[in-house]
Amino acid sequence: KKEDGESTAPTPRPKILRCKCHHHCPEDSVNNICSTDGYCFTMIEEDDSGMPVVTSGCLGLEGSDFQCRDTPIPHQRRSIECCTERNECNKDLHPTLPPLKNRDFVDGPIHHK
């Protein structure tokens, strides 16, 4: 008989990672913190008017490798960074928008400062 407080070795299970979420908080988030078995992320992208928007949150383990790979999308300025090394690690991620390509100056809208 096992002593109380003693059990067989645990089966490996994913450990929850808590991430800061902003503009991307799921329905179960509390105080702008979400939980995941995958990665925390911070992303910067241009909105329809060309203004930079920063989003952060949780990515599930499934598909996160692909989502965290910063593959360039034509005519879309976007950058994403992911982390897992500690809880709320995405507080310290600061992705920057990739530089405008020359073609974007021609095709894209003109933004006045």
Epitope: S7, P10, R13, K15, P26, D28, D37, N87, E88
Partner: antibody
Framework: QVQLQQPGAELVKPGASVKLSCKAS????????MHWVKQRPGQGLEWIGD????????NYNQKFKGKATLTVDTTSSTAYMQLSSLTSEDSAVYYC??????????WGQGTTLTVSS | DIVMTQSPSSLAMSVGQKVTMSCKSS????????????LAWYQQKPGQSPKLLVY???TRESGVPDRFIGSGSGTDFTLTISSVQAEDLADYFC?????????FGAGTKLELK
């Protein structure tokens, strides 16, 4: 095998503080969250909070903020919960328990805390 | 906070009978992202610490007899013991692991006739 060892009992005077311990073995200490749960006779189970031993990140039940402080010593694979300004309401069994995903895979045997003068 | 309500508070059964106990949550425990219900059941025998029986509403913990069956979705959950044994005399608690603070039901005490 997983073991979460807790002292059987603690007797403390009202107004004092106590530091309860939970010594973990049989698994990688930093791979699970460590939780603390309170059980008073006839009052069910109450979650106090949890700590991730890998980075000491804590979550607390609002009800226990200011009452409980969770810490870990990774060198000895021991979790601690300090309870302050003790009253008779704090008399209870306190369990440590580990989780991957916020359900409790394994529990310690519990420490019975008695607050009495 | 999510409030968990268990019923009945106690029930007396004979060995071999089928037992069902209920747990209701004040909000849905179903996550749309993975279609899982974040509810666990525990058994606590007199003088012992609780023991995990079921998590994600219906996943039986390794080593738990298959007479223990968790079911339900959203806000209504059931733990069924298909054929109660003398060693099942215990308190049974449900717990939501949907978000923090984690909360428990008040328990159902199973007594034997």
């Amino acid at each position: 095998q997983v073991q979460l060892q807790q002292p059987g009992a603690e007797l403390v005077k009202p107004g004092a503080s106590v530091k309860l311990s939970c010594k973990a073995s049989g698994y990688t200490f930093t791979s699970y969250w460590m939780h603390w749960v309170k059980q008073r006779p006839g009052q069910g189970l109450e979650w106090i909070g949890d700590i991730d031993p890998s980075d000491r990140y804590t979550n607390y039940n609002q009800k226990f903020k200011g009452k409980a402080t969770l810490t870990v010593d990774t060198t000895s694979s021991t979790a601690y919960m300090q309870l302050s300004s003790l009253t008779s309401e704090d008399s209870a069994v306190y369990y440590c328990a580990i989780s991957g995903w916020d359900y409790f895979d394994y529990w310690g045997q519990g420490t019975t805390l008695t607050v009495s003068s | 906070d999510i409030v968990m309500t268990q019923s009945p508070s106690s029930l007396a059964m004979s060995v071999g009978q089928k037992v069902t106990m209920s747990c209701k949550s004040s909000q849905s425990l179903l996550k749309s992202s993975n279609q899982k219900n974040y509810l666990a059941w525990y058994q606590q025998k007199p003088g012992q610490s609780p023991k995990l029986l079921v998590y994600f509403a219906s996943t039986r913990e390794s080593g738990v007899p298959d007479r223990f069956i968790g079911s339900g979705s959203g806000t209504d959950f059931t733990l069924t013991i298909s054929s109660v044994q003398a060693e099942d005399l215990a308190d049974y608690f449900c717990q939501q692991h949907y978000n923090i603070p984690l909360t428990f039901g008040a328990g159902t005490k199973l007594e034997l006739k």
